[in-house]
Amino acid sequence: LEVSESPGSIQVARGQPAVLPCTFTTSAALINLNVIWMVTPLSNANQPEQVILYQGGQMFDGAPRFHGRVGFTGTMPATNVSIFINNTQLSDTGTYQCLVNNLPDIGGRNIGVTGLTVLVPPSAPHCQIQGSQDIGSDVILLCSSEEGIPRPTYLWEKLDNTLKLPPTATQDQVQGTVTIRNISALSSGLYQCVASNAIGTSTCLLDLQVISPQPRNIG
């Protein structure tokens, strides 16, 4: 019995279905086929869980969190024992193993391993201003998304003529900050933060209105 090499790892957007491949060759009939799919979750590597089981011509549910979401892609028994996971969740990220036994065929590699990573687009980021908006001050524009896998990068742009930030601005795309030094009337306007990762983008806005000093009445 020989389980074929798997692609190594699969990436899927949260909520989308994933297919985890596992095929094998055997010299025996599929009368005594026994397939166990296990997962070692990334979030809890010490706690492997059963995903689905095929034994004695019947299918059995694995861990409760997979109930109703997991099944074999084809009619069993078969030499293709790939499974699907519907409505993928962040907690589905992990290393999946298919363990195949088909007596009396013994020996050979009877385990296939596939990694699954569930990707999450950035959630709507939160934009805020830190510092005084008085003319001549320094301000920091902050942007962060609560969710996003892989971790989002943050790009600030001024929704003005060209999308470019003022020359006095410096940004950190990892932290999601922009520092604008010595703000002037020209710094006023609408700023957009774009949080993006491999599977999506999300935006928030800040309306920066620089406050000019009030002329003093001399009298």
Partner: antibody, heavy 117, light 107 residues
Framework: DVQLQESGPGLVKPSQSLSLTCTVT?????????WNWIRQFPGNKLEWMGY???????IYNPSLKSRISITRDTSKNHFFLQLNSVTTEDTATYYC??????????WGQGTLVTVSA | DIQMTQSPASLSASVGETVTITCRAS??????LAWYQQKQGKSPQLLVY???TLAEGVPSRFSGSGSGTQFSLKINSLQPEDFGSYYC?????????FGGGTKLEIK
């Protein structure tokens, strides 16, 4: 001066994909600005569809997010619209346009796309 | 999404008259509003952005005003080339949305 020109098939069958190209001359699409697709329905209603920015990310109208893709070819100074699973409701004149602050200072002349069996 | 409501949907005026078109936003958009003119069979042309800034090459008889949720476009001393359709559009982030348009016809 910057010029934009739309091109693509004028007739698409329902359930198929609509693909259009915007050719930009007189300005590099990687220098500045956002490069947009806007459509105008037969009743004259205008709808912004999305843009690809000079830096390469794309933002889409949430009403189209599951069907739309905007990409670019920087070597040819082109950007593209793909709209999947079209219906007769997608019949419109499609414009490409350049924006900075989300107002559209330069537009192509538009191309009529009819969705019909 | 922010809804933009234009009025009137159509109006007739004579050359030399002054007309005003109004636009209402469903929420506060500060001064982030643009106006466009569109002639039959042509693409829209930017007239005004940031509520009152005239786009390059736009005659001074056009003027925009307003902030918050209420805006207007005024055309003084109408010229024959001013007849067509006019649209407002908010540019307060994405998605930008347009008004339904105002058709300006010759009386």
């Amino acid at each position: 001066d910057v010029q934009l020109q739309e091109s693509g098939p004028g007739l698409v069958k329902p359930s198929q994909s609509l693909s259009l190209t915007c050719t930009v001359t007189g300005y590099s699409i990687t220098s500045d600005y956002a490069w947009n697709w806007i459509r105008q329905f037969p009743g004259n209603k205008l709808e912004w569809m999305g843009y690809i920015s000079y830096s390469g990310y794309a933002i889409y109208n949430p009403s189209l997010k599951s069907r739309i893709s905007i990409t670019r070819d920087t070597s040819k100074n082109h950007f593209f619209l793909q709209l999947n699973s079209v219906t007769t409701e997608d019949t419109a004149t499609y414009y490409c346009a350049r924006s900075g602050g989300s107002w559209f200072a330069y537009w192509g002349q538009g191309t009529l796309v009819t969705v019909s069996a | 999404d922010i809804q933009m409501t234009q009025s009137p949907a159509s109006l007739s005026a004579s050359v030399g008259e002054t007309v005003t078109i109004t636009c209402r936003a469903s929420e506060n958009i500060n001064s982030y509003l643009a106006w466009y003119q569109q002639k039959q069979g042509k693409s829209p042309q930017l007239l005004v952005y940031n509520a009152k800034t005239l786009a390059e090459g736009v005659p001074s008889r056009f003027s925009g005003s307003g902030s918050g949720t209420q805006f207007s476009l005024k055309i003084n001393s109408l010229q024959p080339e001013d007849f067509g359709s006019y649209y407002c559009q908010h540019h307060y982030g994405t998605p930008p949305t347009f008004g339904g348009g105002t058709k300006l016809e010759i009386k």
